[in-house]
Structure formats: C-alpha cells, structure tokens
C-alpha cells in the first residue's frame, strides 16, 4: 500500500527557519501535493502550499519556498517571523493525491531533540566567534606562508644562479592550463526547481532519497476513490470566496493575488487538497 513520509528540520544557523520534506512511497503518478500545518487538511489544518507537478506551486505565509525534489518528493521552507517559534511544537501534514485513484496523507513534527526549548541551541555569538577564529587562523597561515616565501627568496639571492640553456621546446607547451568548472559540473550545480511557481519535468529528475530521512506515516489517511492525469500551463491565482452558513460558494471582495484560495463550502474553512485535470476553456 502507498505510504507518505514526513520529515521536519530546523535550520542550524537560523532557528526561525524550518524545512518540511515529504515523499510518496508507492506506485502511480502524483497529480497534486498539499502541505498543511496544525493538523491534516480539512480537519483543522491550515494550508501552506499546493504543488502541481506541471503547473508549479501556490503557497501562503509563512511558507517561503515550495519545490519538487524528485517526482515523488517535495520540500517546503518556512520562515517564522515570531520571536517564539510556534513551529517547534507544530504538526505538519502532507497529502499526495492522484485523481481519481485516491489520496494519501501523513503528518510529522520536529523531533524533540531538535526542539529549541529542550536542547540549548547555538547562539549567534558563538557562531560569530567561530567564524572569527577561522578568519584569524587563515590570516596566520597566510602570514606564515608569506614569511616563509620571503625567507626562501633571500636564500635564493645568495646562491649563484645556473645559466639556462636555450630550448627548442614550443613556449606554448609550457603555458599553464587554466582550471574552470566543466559544463557538466556547472549544469549539475544549477537547480531548476529551486524557484517558486516553476514547472518541472519528471523525466529529468533523478534525485535520490536523502539518507536518514525517516518515514513517519503517522495519522496516515487513505481515501480510496476509484485512475491518472495530465496538464500544463502557467499559474494564475484567483479571487476570493468566504464561507456562509450552509452556503456552497459565496463571493467576497477582491483579495490580493496569492493570499490564499478563497472558495469555502462550509464554515471553519482552512486547509487544502488537490489533484488534476484540464478544462479546454477559451
């Protein structure tokens, strides 16, 4: 049976930065991924991002960057603006959907060991001191190197210099070859999926499952629904709807783009879910 794993990481250098990694283990193609926090989608959770394999992503604060890592895994960077980090004790949920086959959802949270409240995190000051020590150390090595070179040059002055014999060797053969990254390595360094609202090509993805990413299929929910999908084109965020008691859709005032989807079927509306399909509308 398909399984969803979730891993939450806190950035070592920035205590306010978190990254949620989610992956789908199972056959079939994923048509949409939804990431929410505070609980599963549609059950008290608040939507953070929706990722489509071809059409890109939509995200809402505090999500900073959502991207595909492989055909079946995604990552979401979060920026916590608050002084006290609410992410530390928060549950993050990822839902992988394949229309009309079904959807699978799992939740996870930051491991207790990495909770800033439980283990004293490195403060910015020691980090700066460590950097300073590195700079000073490097400076010392360079100064010592320069002194040593001067010493060698002085010794060289006092020695008789041997005469160089003329050579028929082509001077070009003695030219040093400049080092530069190859096209292949440059291409490897470029990540086409690092930006938001980007599309991705499943055929080109080959990123391996990172070592040590634990599978956490807690609260796994499977919605069997009964086969696959395809689509393409750019993103366009739409207007807004607000929930009304027993109202299906009720239109509200304009909302700035990407502030969140706005169609609510019923009260207490938060969180998302998604899959795929294409309307040939002109």
């Amino acid at each position: 049976t398909p399984e969803v794993w979730v891993q939450v990481q806190m950035e070592a250098t920035e205590l306010s930065s978190f990254t949620v990694h989610c992956g789908f283990l199972g056959p079939g193609s994923i048509s949409l991924v939804t990431v929410s926090w505070g609980g599963p989608d549609g059950a008290g959770g608040t939507k953070l991002a929706v990722l489509h394999p071809e059409l890109g992503t939509r995200q809402w604060a505090p999500a900073r960057q959502a991207r595909w890592e492989t055909q079946s895994s995604i990552s979401l960077a979060l920026e916590d603006s608050g002084a006290s980090s609410p992410f530390a004790n928060t549950t993050f949920c990822c839902k992988f959907a394949s229309f009309p086959e079904g959807s699978w959802e799992s939740c996870g949270s930051l491991p207790p060991s990495s909770d800033p409240g439980l283990s004293a995190p490195p403060t910015p000051v020691p980090i700066l001191r460590a950097d300073l020590a590195g700079i000073l150390g490097l400076s010392g090595v360079l100064l010592f190197g320069c002194g040593y070179l001067l010493h060698l040059l002085r010794r060289q002055k006092h020695r008789p210099t041997p005469r160089l014999q003329p050579s028929h060797t082509n001077s070009q053969a003695l030219t040093a070859q400049a080092w530069a990254p190859s096209q292949a390595s440059q291409a490897a360094l470029h990540d086409p999926y690092a930006t938001i609202n980007t599309s991705f090509c499943p055929a080109t993805l080959d990123t391996a499952h990172p070592n040590g990413w634990a599978s956490l299929p807690t609260h796994a929910a499977h919605q069997p629904q009964g086969p696959a999908a395809s689509a393409s084109t750019p993103i366009l965020a739409r207007g807004s709807f607000v929930s009304v008691e027993n109202g299906l859709y009720t239109q509200a005032g304009e909302r700035p783009p990407h502030t969140g989807p706005g169609l609510t079927l019923f009260p207490d509306c938060r969180g998302p879910r998604a899959v795929e399909g294409r309307f040939g509308v002109r």
Partner: nanobody, 121 residues
Framework: DVQLVESGGGSVQAGGSLRLSCVAS????????MGWFRQAPGKEHEGVAH???????RYVDSVKGRFTISQDHAKNTLYLQMNSLKPEDSATYYC???????????????WGQGTQVTVSS
Amino acid sequence: DVQLVESGGGSVQAGGSLRLSCVASRYTSRTDCMGWFRQAPGKEHEGVAHIDSDGIPRYVDSVKGRFTISQDHAKNTLYLQMNSLKPEDSATYYCVVGFKFDDDYCAPNDWGQGTQVTVSS
C-alpha cells in the same frame, strides 16, 4: 472529512438528457473551484465544467452549448444539466472541489465516487 456524493447518472438514448447532482458535506477546506470531471474506460480523465471564484461557469469545448453547470447554495449542491447527449459522453462523472492554477484548470482536491452515464446510439 469531506464527502461529495454524486447522483443522477443512468442510461439514456442519444439526444436525451440527464441531470447530475453533487451534494457536499462536512467540508472544512478552502478551495477555488468546484466542477465535474469524467473518465471513459481506457481514456484519460478530462474536466467537463467548473465554476470558480469569479462565479463564471467554464466548459470544455466538446460540451459547450449542451451542458450547463449550476449550484444551489442553500442545498450545498452542484448540478450538471446534460442535454443532447452523444455516445461519446458515456463515462463515469466525478464531482470535484479543487484549486485553480489558471483560468481553464481546476485541480481536484477532493472528489466523489462518481456516477455512471451511458449514452446509446
């Protein structure tokens, strides 16, 4: 969790009509659009029609002028009135709620079990 229950499917002769209904209940997730998808055996699924946040109905070219999508807020129900049915309209029809990625695309977030529509010539 959300429940979308379709009804109204059945068998009909070419040129006939059917009205599909979808009742939404226990839905607590904000979405951008609600509509109908269909899938015929051995074929890719396709979006038939949807209503998005601007309230304007949108249709796939093959059903324009024949199908009408509408909703009843009081009953939390979505409808698809299908007239002048053709054999190629035969498929399982799914009611979906989802997210907009562009004007003519509603990415299903939740969907029902589907209702079968068979049109004989």
